[in-house]
């Protein structure tokens, strides 16, 4: 009797089972009682990345530099084309599909984890004992200055955006 | 339903061509099918001749040589066969088929 | 070339009793995909050649039941499990996987 499930990388059409077409073909025509399936290999700008039944091959991404975007892998009749985005720029999605410029840690935020082509900043309140002043991208939270290790005494005490203030202890005692 | 008529001339003079079409009706020759000719000499066993497909590629029996020519029309659903310099043992009953559908068959005589 | 022997040549059968006709190729019929393109005809006095079983085992639409294939690699049997007044005729093996495709000479079932 004629099958109701195939085996893998094989489908089920006409009530028989049909060899499916290997990574980086398509399928021109299912197979018959008397041929195999009919695959042809996807052109040089388009890819199948499975066993598959599709009659079109997808085209690869293009990596389109008015939206920050290069080519970081070029794509292959199995695999897309991979982009990242330019210098300073990070994707706005998972799919990478436009850049946007990496965002800078205010003043009491400090860097935690620079960015990527793939990931933006990752910023962290400086904790007690530590400052950020400026806004960056690129600076993490630096410690308040020792006034100790300087012969100093505090006179301002320092906050997340600004360092202590040091001076001279008081001789008049 | 996929049916199959052949047609062309029951008499060749020796020497000459045999030219034969086959007319496909109730399905579409523009397929994953092999599109066939048999024949079958009076009294005999079936012999292949060859087949053709949609995009014109083919395979023809070794046996016939380079006797042997096949093509296809698929503005009219059609497929052909040329066979030269014919003889009297080409004498048979001439069958297109696409294997799961045959034609009923025409006697082409070699004959001076 | 494929050389495709069955046997017997002529089967004599008694209405209602089974029947079998071997079928042997000189080389393996199975392909690298594990598809084994072995085809059974049955061709009445008259008639053009028709078909029963595809891919050794596989009954074709509308063939009755009491016809079955088996086989693998090199060696397939054709069983009619009662055979009918009808069944008369020669049956043809058929091999698709290699090219040239080669039929069996032939079996003649006739009823005794």
């Known amino acids: 009797e004629p099958p109701t499930a195939c085996r893998e990388k094989q489908y089920l059409i006409n009530s028989q089972c049909c060899s499916l077409c290997q990574p980086g073909q398509k399928l021109v025509s299912d197979c018959t009682e008397f041929t195999e399936t009919e695959c042809l290999p996807c052109s040089e700008s388009e890819f199948l990345d499975t066993w598959n039944r599709e009659t079109r091959c997808h085209q690869h991404k293009y990596c389109d530099p008015n939206l920050g975007l290069r080519v970081q892998q070029k794509g292959t009749s199995e695999t897309d084309t991979i982009c990242t985005c330019e210098e300073g720029l990070h994707c706005m999605s998972e799919s990478c599909e436009s850049c946007v410029p990496h965002r800078s840690c205010l003043p009491g935020f400090g860097v935690k984890q620079i960015a990527t082509g793939v990931s933006d900043t990752i910023c962290e309140p400086c904790p007690v004992g530590f400052f950020s002043n400026v806004s960056s991208a690129f600076e993490k939270c630096r410690p308040w200055t020792s006034c100790e290790t300087k012969d100093l005494v505090v006179q301002q005490a320092g906050t997340n955006k600004t360092d202590v203030v040091c001076g001279p202890q008081d001789r008049q005692r | 339903q996929v049916q199959l008529q052949e047609s062309g001339p029951g008499l060749v003079k020796p020497s000459d061509t045999l030219s034969l079409t086959c007319a496909v009706s109730?399905?579409?020759?523009?397929?994953?099918?092999?599109w066939n000719w048999i024949r079958q000499p009076p009294g005999k066993g079936l012999e292949w001749i060859g087949y053709?497909?949609?995009?014109?590629?083919?395979n023809y029996n070794p046996s016939l040589k380079n006797r042997v020519t096949m093509s296809v029309d698929t503005s009219k659903n059609q497929f052909s066969l040329k066979l030269s310099s014919v003889t009297a043992v080409d004498t048979a009953v001439y069958y297109c088929?696409?294997?799961?559908?045959w034609g009923q068959g025409t006697l082409v005589t070699v004959s001076s | 070339d494929v050389v495709m022997t069955q046997s017997p040549l002529s089967l004599p059968v008694t209405l209602g009793q089974p029947a079998s006709i071997s079928c042997r190729s000189s080389?393996?019929?199975?392909?690298?995909?594990?598809?084994?393109?072995l085809n059974w005809f049955q061709q009445r006095p008259g008639q053009s050649p028709r078909r029963l079983i595809y891919?050794?085992?596989n009954r074709f639409s509308g063939v009755p039941d009491r016809f079955s294939g088996s086989g693998s690699g090199t060696d397939f049997t054709l069983k009619i499990s009662r055979v009918e007044a009808e069944d008369v005729g020669v049956y043809y093996c058929?091999?698709?996987?290699?090219?040239?495709?080669?039929f069996g000479q032939g079996t003649k079932l006739e009823i005794k």
């Open positions: 080389q393996s019929l199975e392909n690298s995909n594990g598809n084994t393109f």
């Open positions: 053709i497909k949609y995009d014109g590629s083919n």
């Open positions: 058929l091999q698709v996987t290699h090219v040239p495709f080669t």
């Open positions: 109730g399905y579409s020759i523009t397929t994953n099918y092999y």
């Open positions: 891919k050794v085992s």
């Open positions: 088929a696409r294997l799961d559908y």
